[in-house]
């Protein structure tokens, strides 16, 4: 071409009719005018659909690729059963990496880039309808859904997309039910759906399969009041529409079937991308024909990337953008409602949000009020945990009933049968057996069931844990264990147990208002202060006692000798007086001991001057010894008490852990989480982690057996234990104040009523009564200010 001639860029198209080919040529002319054609001139080359795949592939080669087309537009074939007519176009052009722009093709398979590697489209796939369903769920606050999908690529794609969206909202379908495409019997599947709590049914199926589902649903009375049917476009088209129930909500892609509008927008996108592409360097021309040509178009992948990143704001069909799969983003849908066999637009999805027109909607059963979306199951699965005094677990009698017992008030203890592992000790085989549960939480459950009109079956948590998030197989994925895990997985509908309300749990489940306010405290063994019989020896060391004992006898002997042999001893003032006898050895002993033990000596004192001097020195020494001993004895008796009790969470023995002082809590409990989360308690946590117990009962026993010096746990439980087991005592101030709440899933229909019922129970004194009955009654004398007593131990 001459230097001043524009570059000719051929654009190919496979369209439904000659009329559409004419529209395509007009759109190309419009694009040339819009961009100015002095540099680049677009040229339209088109064919209509061929009756079979081989002819279609040949036509693409002979009529389009031979013209060196930069891109090929392809509409969906007019025959509804000939689903894969764009496939030969996609395969043939894709082989050479020539981008293909689908105009009205909605099947999700075309999003698979490993199969359709050069395919983009100006419409979204059917699976993207999941985004609209998800948004409708949000707008109408429907959290309980049943997903009914055909077990084919389309159904699985819709399911995957919806599940991903639900996961982001930390939610999930109550049940996903799959059926084989073309099946004629879905009754059993729908029967299963009917048993569930959810009443919002989302259906993804072909026209014919949808018709089968609707017929079966009508027979099972699943299309009347209370139900919601959310479907896509295929499910309210053709044969499906004949059987669809009134009140169904379906979707229609706005301009979805408007081939001429999509031709216009696709040409606009291609024109914009061509101009962008040709500004880049090293652009090669597309292949000319297929015969003998196996080389890909080198610039093809680059052109596809340019197309995919295009933003065409002023399209006839709205804003045209593509996602990473080449599918149209921000598509607009009409929300259609079947009323009296007619489809009525009752809302819009504008690419991001649903704008409903509630005035126009008629719900199944002719209702004008939005259905709740669930039926409240009145039989609830309750999970609990053995934790006295909140939940006692005892074996059943031989006849399978529970032994009759009475509370401290003389009322019969209310017991319920609860199934659960018969032994929680590690290593022993665990069998699920019926047992008897009773206690604070069981009384509360019975009260709630009565006021809120539900029945229940109680089971003990299988792993014996309250619930923490743990990594799965060292991956980054975390899963809840314990009662939390059972609630979230649907094995339980409600946790009725002393479950601590904390932020981490509250992100995933709904807590009721607290039924018990408490905190953490520390349980230690009560050391009764005792003094042993030999404690009077303690003020002096044994060497000193030995020296004192020796001194007594040495002094006595010295006195005896001095008194016996001193020449002064014989000096008489008055010779008439009878001569006094010198000290005998025994009286010298008597004198020596007497002085030491401070007894008044009436006779047998030394007579000689020298002996008396020694006696005075000894008396002085004795006075010092006795005074020292007395003072020390008093001090020792005062100090002869056990090591000072833990003062609280800030006690140095806790803050500076050592193996001499072992403290712990229960593994994977809220206390465990608390210590793990608090940075300033990290040293404590590292110590505790090594010593934590499987259950509170085991830890309490360990304290009693002196294997554990301190057990950190819920104050309500520990205060109760200390009041029952007289060798235990709680110590220190409460810390990490919290409460126990009843746990429910976020979407639980019971959550408001449970909280209201608990608040009423606080107001009317019921909780106070439970507290008196189960938690606050005393078995032990709580006073611990007795003086040290002497014992024979």
């Amino acid at each position: 071409r001459a230097a001043c001639d524009p570059k000719i860029v051929n654009i190919g198209a496979v369209l439904s009719t000659r009329k559409h080919e004419q529209m395509f040529r007009e759109a190309v002319n419009q694009a040339n005018k819009r961009h100015g054609s002095w540099k680049i001139q677009l040229n339209a080359t088109s064919v209509t659909h061929k009756p079979n795949a081989i002819q279609m592939a040949l036509s693409v080669c002979e009529d389009l690729i031979s013209s060196q087309v930069y891109a090929i537009l392809v509409s969906h074939p007019p025959t509804p059963n000939d689903h894969f007519t764009p496939t030969p176009v996609s395969y043939t052009a894709g082989f050479y990496r020539i981008p293909v722009l689908g105009l009205t093709t909605r099947m999700s398979i075309y999003s698979d880039k490993s199969i359709h590697l050069s395919f983009l489209r100006t419409v979204p796939p059917y699976s993207h309808q999941s985004s609209v369903w998800f948004e409708m769920m949000r707008v109408y606050s429907w959290n309980h859904i049943i997903l009914l999908v055909s077990d084919d690529h389309e159904g699985r794609a819709a399911q995957k997309r919806l599940e991903t969206l639900l996961e982001e909202r930390e939610s999930k379908a109550e049940k996903v039910l799959q059926f084989d495409p073309g099946t004629k019997n879905v009754t059993a599947l729908l029967m299963e759906a009917k048993e569930l709590e959810a009443r919002v049914i989302i259906l993804s199926a072909s026209e014919d399969d949808a018709a089968t589902v609707y017929r079966a649903a009508a027979m099972l009375n699943m299309t009347g009041s209370g139900y919601v049917w959310l479907v896509g476009e295929r499910e309210i088209s053709g044969n499906a529409l004949r059987y669809a129930p009134d009140g169904i909500l379906g979707l229609q892609l706005i301009n979805g079937k408007n081939e001429s509008a999509h031709i216009s927008d696709a040409v606009g996108v291609v024109a914009q991308a061509v101009h962008e592409l040709l500004e880049k360097e090293n652009i090669t021309d597309p292949p000319r024909g297929c015969v003998g040509n196996t080389n890909i178009w080198k610039t093809g992948p680059l052109f596809k990337r340019v197309l995919m990143s295009s933003k065409y704001a002023d399209g006839v069909t709205g804003r045209v953008e593509f996602n990473e799969d080449g599918d149209r983003k921000f598509a607009n849908y009409s929300i259609m409602n079947l009323q009296n066999r007619k489809l009525v637009q009752v809302g819009i999805y504008n690419g991001t949000h649903v704008i409903p027109n509630d005035r126009k909607i008629i719900w199944p059963g002719g209702e004008t009020e939005k259905p709740r979306g669930y039926q409240m199951s009145t039989r609830l699965k309750i999970v609990t945990i053995h934790q006295e005094p909140f939940v006692y677990v005892k074996p059943t009698l031989s006849d399978g009933t529970c032994k009759e017992e009475f509370t401290v008030n003389g009322d019969p203890v209310k017991k319920v049968i609860c199934t659960g592992p018969n032994d929680t000790s590690p290593g022993s085989p665990r069998h699920t057996v019926p047992q008897c549960c009773y206690g604070f939480c069981i009384d509360l459950l019975i009260k709630l069931a009565r006021t809120m009109n539900f029945t229940y079956e109680v089971h003990l948590v299988a792993d014996g844990k309250f619930g923490t998030q743990e990594r799965v197989n060292n991956s980054n994925k975390k899963e809840w264990n314990g009662m939390m895990g059972e609630l979230l997985s649907g094995q339980a509908d409600m946790i009725v147990a002393p479950l601590t309300i904390n932020n981490e749990r509250a992100q995933y489940i709904e807590f009721s208002k607290p039924f018990k306010y408490q905190g953490l405290t520390i349980l230690v063994k009560k050391e009764i202060p005792r003094s042993t019989l030999d404690s009077f020896m303690q003020p002096f060391q044994s060497t000193l006692w030995l020296l004192v004992g020796l001194s007594v006898h040495v002094v006595a002997v010295m006195l005896y000798l001095l008194d016996r042999f001193s020449p002064f001893g014989r000096f008489k003032v008055n010779s008439e007086e009878e001569e006094e006898d010198a000290l005998t050895l025994s009286s010298a002993m008597w004198f020596s001991w007497g002085v030491l033990l401070n007894s008044g000596i009436g006779e047998g004192a030394p007579r000689s001057f020298s002996a008396r001097i020694l006696g005075m020195v000894w008396a002085g020494f004795a006075m010092i010894i006795v005074a020292s001993y007395t003072a020390n004895l008093a001090a020792f008796l005062v100090l002869d008490r056990p090591e000072e009790r833990i003062t609280g969470i800030n006690d140095p023995r806790l803050r500076n852990p050592s193996d001499k002082f072992i403290y712990a809590t229960v593994k994977q409990s809220s206390v465990d989480i608390y210590f793990r989360r608090q940075v300033e308690l990290s040293t404590m946590y590292r110590h505790m982690e090594k010593h934590n117990y499987e259950s509170a009962a085991e830890a309490i026993q360990a304290v009693r057996d002196n294997k554990l010096h301190a057990f950190i746990w819920d104050s309500a439980v520990l205060e109760f234990e200390a009041s029952q087991k007289c060798d235990l005592v709680t110590t220190g101030e409460l810390f990490f104040r919290s409460g126990f709440g009843i746990g429910m899933r976020k979407d639980s229909p019971w959550k408001q009523n449970v909280s209201l019922s608990i608040l009423k129970s606080h107001e009317n004194g019921f909780m106070e009564d439970l507290d008196k009955t189960w938690v606050r009654y005393q078995e032990c004398d709580s006073r611990s200010n007795a003086p040290a007593t002497l014992t024979f131990e």
Epitope: Q339, V344, Q345, I355, R359, K360, G366, T368
Partner: antibody, heavy 119, light 107 residues
Framework: QVQLQESGPGLVKPSQTLSLTCSVT?????????WHWIRQPPGKGLEWIAY???????DSNPSLKNRVTISRDTSKNQFSLKLSSVTAADTAVYYC????????????WGQGTLVTVSS | DIQMTQSPSSLSASVGDRVTITCRPS??????LAWYQQKPGKAPKLLVY???NLADGVPSRFSGSGSGTDYTLTISSLQPEDIATYYC?????????FGQGTKLEIK
């Protein structure tokens, strides 16, 4: 062919109740569609008053709500409008019309009846 | 309530002229709009529904377009029998409201 025909007194005294009836021929009012009353004061624009649906449910303009009663007589294939406590401002041509709710439009209209409120 | 602002309120055009009447709702009505023609002393007659669809029996010179909050009724070639008042009306929310009307006259 569907036809709608309004009937009722042409003159109503202030504070009294205006009563109008729309007779429908060529289509059963219980089969489908929404059946409306619309009015047009002399020389002014159109104002929607109320509708009754094929299933008997109804709705009316909030600005008139506490004065409007809409009902139907299925045996005569008629629907009626009662507007209480009328004033001179209620003087208008009253039309009945059929709404094709699927296409969101009034596709059939009666020829209208003028009601004057005056003492 | 959604307010419907119609413009112009009146216009004069010659036979064969292209005439456009616009209607602007106070909020998005998502193409839930109808156009009516009312001749003096007569009931209104449906011309266009759902913003762009021509009602049965309406001449093809009438067309509707628009979306969101901007709608247009176009008469491609004005005929003498088109002399009337034209009303737009939304059906999105309750209550459905009408524009104040555009009176079309022949020059």
């Amino acid at each position: 062919q569907v036809q709608l025909q309004e009937s009722g007194p042409g003159l109503v005294k202030p504070s009294q109740t205006l009563s109008l009836t729309c007779s429908v021929t060529g289509y059963s009012i219980t089969s489908d569609y929404y059946w409306h009353w619309i009015r047009q004061p002399p020389g002014k624009g159109l104002e929607w008053i109320a509708y009754i649906r094929y299933d008997g449910r109804n709705d009316s303009n909030p600005s008139l709500k506490n004065r409007v009663t809409i009902s139907r007589d299925t045996s005569k294939n008629q629907f009626s409008l009662k507007l209480s406590s009328v004033t001179a401002a209620d003087t208008a041509v009253y039309y009945c019309a059929r709404e094709d709710y699927a296409s969101s439009s009034f596709d059939y209209w009666g020829q209208g009846t003028l009601v004057t409120v005056s003492s | 309530d959604i307010q419907m602002t119609q413009s112009p309120s009146s216009l004069s055009a010659s036979v064969g002229d292209r005439v456009t009447i616009t209607c602007r709702p106070s909020e998005n009505i998502y193409s839930n709009l109808a156009w009516y023609q009312q001749k003096p002393g007569k009931a209104p007659k449906l011309l266009v529904y759902a913003a762009t669809n021509l009602a049965d029996g309406v001449p093809s010179r009438f067309s509707g377009s628009g979306s969101g909050t901007d709608y247009t009724l176009t008469i491609s070639s004005l005929q003498p029998e088109d002399i009337a008042t034209y009303y737009c009306q939304h059906f999105w929310d309750s209550p459905p409201t009408f524009g104040q009307g555009t009176k079309l006259e022949i020059k």
